[in-house]
Interface confidence: low
């Protein structure tokens, strides 16, 4: 239904608080380098304008689209050219090209300082002194570092952030109360950002059809009692929500997500028996809860899939009449029966089924041609099963840190051209699959592991896209969304790589390593490990292990020394020389 003033419509639907928060997120995700105060000023101006439109929808400019209003506002920033360079050229374009231009300049790895958390007393004083500004800063800092963060979900995080400070700043031991909560929010936030980034990449790089296929598979696993028509409706609505958020239309996205949650809760009897608790919560918690809800139980006595999709004489007729609907039904029926499969595996099976029908429905005897299609699924199912089994065994044998190191070596040898920080970040995250998924029983391992790996490999793909350095990475990232993980798994050592020249500076360490947290110290060591492999890609596991053990001993020794800096300087030289000899550098 058309509204005279879109901005007034969204302001009324969302309320002033959510409106302001979402506009701040939108602006920070577009202009990631702009100072906080500048964004607050822009948001206040937009809010005041929206209020005039609420009072009179026919007032001047109130009929303009949100993209026009927001784009015009962003283009008033005085330092646009000097801060953002060619992004300023976007302002010469008309909508919708201007918004597309802004979207293309979103930076997944902005050059911003690492956020450092102050002491608890300092934060509590800041929180009490000006709660509103404190929470706005949180939205701003997260949004500018994560330009695709799912905006309505960021409102949920901000609500939890506020609750943590409200509770803990009154506690007897503020730090014991607050720090674990902040750590949890940080880790969940990173995971949420990465999951949403994959959704946006799926929509933007592979199109709406790819996203809808993913959604059909996932929702069918989650709501196996729902009819196909119901799942299709949810998929259509969910696709609209994520298309909007990924496109920077955050007000529409948040509004439509609230409508979807309302619909699901009003129709939970025909969707899932697991929604009751979610639907009793307030809006932000409700939407989050629905998104994370466990899979409902599978209906009893589901008939064999073969009857409708292999044995029926009408397979090609049904396929020809409405290809995507028929394939959607196949995906729905297969997914609701297989909560034990990853979504990407289900999509590979659907693709194989589609390819077979395309070929066979044009053959002389179609039925004879596609009769054995389900046999083609067996190797596709066994490949991830075997891989997960092997890697979980390795994880249980090594523990998380050493398992990450094994992956660091494996991936550096596969794609040594990729920057060291990216290899460390991605391999560390790949390694977390062990503690995240290997504890699960067999039936839950594959959906946990392979779908998580899809999220992590997408991080590699978006970081690599910014500065492409490896044709192999580009190939695996762009050829097929569902085959990214098998593509990377299949990569062998890159024989074309010319080893990096040895640079002693890379392996020079200082006493500051002693004061680092365990996590930061691990990252330092893992950075050195990647550099070693880049220098000596043919080094054996045993050689690398020996050098890393020596390195760990060196750090431990010097951190206990009275004169730490001298120890690092002198012992460091010896270590470098010994490592060079051990690796034949």
């Amino acid at each position: 239904d058309a509204h005279k003033s879109e901005v007034a419509h969204r302001f009324k639907d969302l309320g002033e608080e959510n409106f302001k928060a979402l506009v701040l997120i939108a602006f920070a995700q577009y202009l990631q380098q702009c100072p906080f105060e500048d964004h607050v000023k822009l948001v206040n101006e937009v809010t005041e304008f929206a209020k005039t439109c609420v009072a009179d929808e026919s007032a001047e400019n109130c009929d303009k689209s949100l993209h026009t209003l927001f784009g015009d506002k962003l283009c008033t920033v005085a330092t646009l050219r000097e801060t953002y360079g060619e992004m300023a050229d976007c302002c010469a374009k008309q909508e919708p090209e201007r918004n597309e231009c802004f979207l293309q300049h979103k930076d997944d790895n902005p050059n911003l300082p690492r956020l450092v958390r102050p002491e608890v007393d300092v934060m509590c004083t800041a929180f009490h002194d000006n709660e509103e500004t404190f929470l706005k800063k949180y939205l701003y800092e997260i949004a500018r570092r994560h330009p695709y963060f799912y905006a309505p979900e960021l409102l949920f995080f901000a609500k939890r952030y506020k609750a943590a400070f409200t509770e803990c700043c009154q506690a007897a031991d503020k730090a014991a109360c607050l720090l674990p909560k902040l750590d949890e929010l940080r880790d969940e936030g990173k995971a949420s950002s990465a999951k949403q980034r994959l959704k946006c990449a799926s929509l933007q790089k592979f199109g709406e059809r790819a996203f809808k296929a993913w959604a059909v598979a996932r929702l069918s696993q989650r709501f196996p009692k729902a009819e196909f028509a119901e799942v299709s409706k949810l998929v259509t609505d969910l696709t609209k929500v994520h298309t909007e958020c990924c496109h920077g239309d955050l007000l529409e996205c948040a509004d439509d997500r609230a409508d979807l949650a309302k619909y699901i809760c009003e129709n939970q009897d025909s969707i899932s028996s697991k929604l009751k608790e979610c639907c009793e919560k307030p809006l932000l918690e409700k939407s989050h809860c629905i998104a994370e809800v466990e899979n409902d139980e599978m209906p009893a006595d589901l008939p064999s899939l073969a009857a409708d999709f292999v044995e029926s004489k009408d397979v090609c007729k049904n396929y020809a009449e409405a290809k995507d609907v028929f394939l959607g039904m196949f995906l729905y029926e297969y997914a609701r029966r297989h909560p034990d499969y990853s979504v990407v595996l289900l999509l590979r099976l659907a693709k194989t089924y589609e390819t077979t029908l395309e070929k066979c429905c044009a053959a002389a005897d179609p039925h004879e041609c596609y009769a054995k299609v389900f046999d083609e699924f067996k190797p596709l199912v066994e490949e991830p099963q075997n891989l997960i089994k092997q890697n979980c065994e390795l994880f249980e044998q090594l523990g998380e840190y050493k398992f990450q190191n094994a992956l660091l070596v494996r991936y550096t040898k596969k794609v040594p051209q990729v920057s060291t920080p990216t290899l460390v970040e991605v391999s560390r995250n790949l390694g977390k699959v062990g503690s995240k998924c290997c504890k699960h029983p067999e039936a839950k391992r594959m959906p946990c592991a392979e779908d998580y790996l899809s999220v992590v490999l997408n991080q590699l793909c978006v970081l690599h896209e910014k500065t492409p350095v490896s044709d192999r990475v580009t190939k695996c990232c762009t050829e097929s969304l569902v085959n990214r993980r098998p593509c990377f798994s299949a990569l062998e050592v890159d024989e074309t790589y010319v080893p990096k020249e040895f640079n002693a500076e890379t392996f020079t360490f200082h006493a500051d390593i002693c004061t680092l947290s365990e996590k930061e110290r691990q990252i330092k060591k893992q950075t050195a490990l990647v550099e070693l492999v880049k220098h000596k890609p043919k080094a054996t596991k045993e050689q690398l292990k020996a050098v890393m053990d020596d390195f760990a001993a060196f750090v431990e020794k010097c951190c206990k020394a009275d004169d730490k800096e001298t120890c690092f300087a002198e012992e460091g030289k010896k270590l470098v020389a010994a490592s060079q000899a051990a690796l034949g550098l």
């Epitope: 100072p35 906080f36 105060e37 300082p113 690492r114 956020l115 450092v116 958390r117 102050p118 002491e119 300092v122 934060m123 004083t125 800041a126 929180f127 002194d129 000006n130 404190f134 800063k137 949180y138 800092e141």
Partner: nanobody, 124 residues
């Protein structure tokens, strides 16, 4: 109103050292987080280092870790930045800043009071 005055800048050869000082007046110094930022010609202002009220926590940008050391003397209302192993890319105007309430040490907008800056030039 807090006033901040930096000193100690100068010209130094690569590998050399300097000690910057920042004297504060007009407020209760021990209640402020103190930070150092720098701005090279034609570049954005960037975070260098920060120190909490009672020196419990110190923070450094990756580019200066292991070379620069921040410290403070609350009895003298002064914060120091020791610059060792200086490089040409450290050439910049170094600003001292004070923050009463902060949620992120590294963000320049968190700091309420700023000095005029002291120039450090590293050149052979």
């Amino acid at each position: 109103e807090v006033q901040l005055v930096e000193s100690g800048g100068g010209v130094v050869q690569p590998g050399g050292s300097l000690r910057l000082s920042c004297a504060a007046s007009g407020g209760t110094f021990s209640t402020y987080v103190m930070g150092w930022f720098r701005q090279a010609p034609g570049k954005e202002r960037e975070f260098v280092s920060a120190i909490s009220q009672n020196s419990i926590h110190t923070y450094y940008a990756d580019s200066v870790k292991g070379r620069f050391t921040i410290s403070r003397d609350n009895s003298k209302n002064t914060v120091y930045l020791q610059l060792n192993s200086l490089r040409p890319e450290d050439t910049a105007l170094y600003y001292c800043a004070a923050s009463r309430f902060t949620s992120w040490y590294t963000a320049d907008y968190e700091y309420d009071y700023w000095g005029q800056g002291t120039l450090v030039t590293v050149s052979s």
